[in-house]
């Protein structure tokens, strides 16, 4: 009685169960009455990451420097190459097929989370008592200067984009 289902790591063909090829190898011939499934290793720059019956290996991903990409982890016969972005850039998607420059936080906004190779800069508005007067991908909101601790008084109030301006206290004559 020919099988209708096969064990794990097998597949059904011509009414018989054949072994799948292991990761890193491709199928070159189904099993027969006389021989086991025949598999061959993937070539240079190719991979297969599962037990399979693929007749062609997949090409390793190319990390195109023209798109701001570089190799984070070199591929093997069983794994794909992992790309990441050059310093100052981040991936546009989870697959990291291209990169864009890290966003800068405008004046009035500070960096809440610095960008990585896979995530963009996260900015936050400077709350009362803090300011940012530059466009930056690194600078957080800075606290206003405390005039009191310098024995000075506020001459000009701070905003989310400017620091307070301190000045000397008026002398009583």
């Amino acid at each position: 009685e020919p099988p209708t289902a096969c064990r794990e790591k097998q597949y059904l063909i011509n009414s018989q169960c054949c072994s799948l090829c292991q990761p890193g190898q491709k199928l070159v011939s189904d099993c027969t009455e006389f021989t086991e499934t025949e598999c061959l290793p993937c070539g240079e720059s190719e991979f297969l990451d599962t037990w399979n019956r693929e007749t062609h290996c997949h090409q390793h991903k190319y990390c195109d420097p023209n798109l701001g990409l570089r190799v984070q982890q070199k591929g093997t016969s069983e794994t794909d190459t992992i790309c990441t972005c050059e310093e100052g850039w981040h991936c546009t998607s989870e697959a990291c097929e291209s990169c864009v420059l890290h966003r800068s936080c405008s004046p009035g906004f500070g960096v809440k989370q610095i960008a990585t190779g896979v995530s963009d800069t996260i900015c936050e508005p400077c709350p009362v008592g803090f300011f940012s007067n530059v466009s930056s991908a690194f600078e957080k909101c800075h606290p206003w200067t405390s005039c009191e601790t310098k024995d000075l008084v506020v001459q000009q109030a701070g905003t989310n984009k400017t620091d307070v301006v301190c000045g000397p206290q008026d002398r009583l004559r």
Partner: antibody, heavy 114, light 112 residues
Framework: QVQLQESGPGLVKPSETLSLTCTVS????????VHWIRQPPGKGLEWIGV???????NYNPSLKSRVTISKDNSKNQVFLKLSSVTAADTAVYYC????????WGQGTLVTVSS | DVVMTQSPLSLPVTLGQPASISCRSS???????????LQWYLQRPGQSPGLLIY???NRFSGVPDRFSGSGSGTDFTLKISRVEAEDVGVYYC?????????FGQGTKLEIK
Amino acid sequence: QVQLQESGPGLVKPSETLSLTCTVSGFSLPTSGVHWIRQPPGKGLEWIGVIWAGGDTNYNPSLKSRVTISKDNSKNQVFLKLSSVTAADTAVYYCLGHGHFDVWGQGTLVTVSS
Amino acid sequence: DVVMTQSPLSLPVTLGQPASISCRSSQSLVHSSGNTYLQWYLQRPGQSPGLLIYKVSNRFSGVPDRFSGSGSGTDFTLKISRVEAEDVGVYYCSQTTHVPWTFGQGTKLEIK
């Protein structure tokens, strides 16, 4: 039914390249591999190599540096080339369809001699 | 490479008597799938080899039931229960579990 027919020159000079053709019928080269096996006169059988359906090849390591197996699917033909032959390569050369081990060609005798 | 060693190399037998040929492999022929790819061929004088037994003990279609194969791992045996005149020739064991495929050196069966 499955049939295989080997053909080629019966005499090859030492240091030259032996070239044989296997013409198949009854099965499809794009879906099946073909093996070459040889047998020196009065001796045992030696597996030379195989060309698989997709064109990939496996060779016997003892012959790998001298062997090339190729094919032309449209002509139902498989080719064996063995370079730099010596008298030790004198043999009957057989082709065999993968999964059709019950059907061998008649074989063709190749003598290496000057 | 897997070395296949047959014994005896020559086997004179009386017609109607049994015959037995041994084949040993230098490493196990059991594939990870659990299958063992050991074949027996008969090459009659002036002919190409013909398949008798595959996967250790399976008789190929049309092969008389006086031929039987047995064994496991590295030790295999071909038995002929009653030798007939047409059984004369050279018997080869062959393994297709490991690449390169290899053959035994052959056992010549002749009638006494």
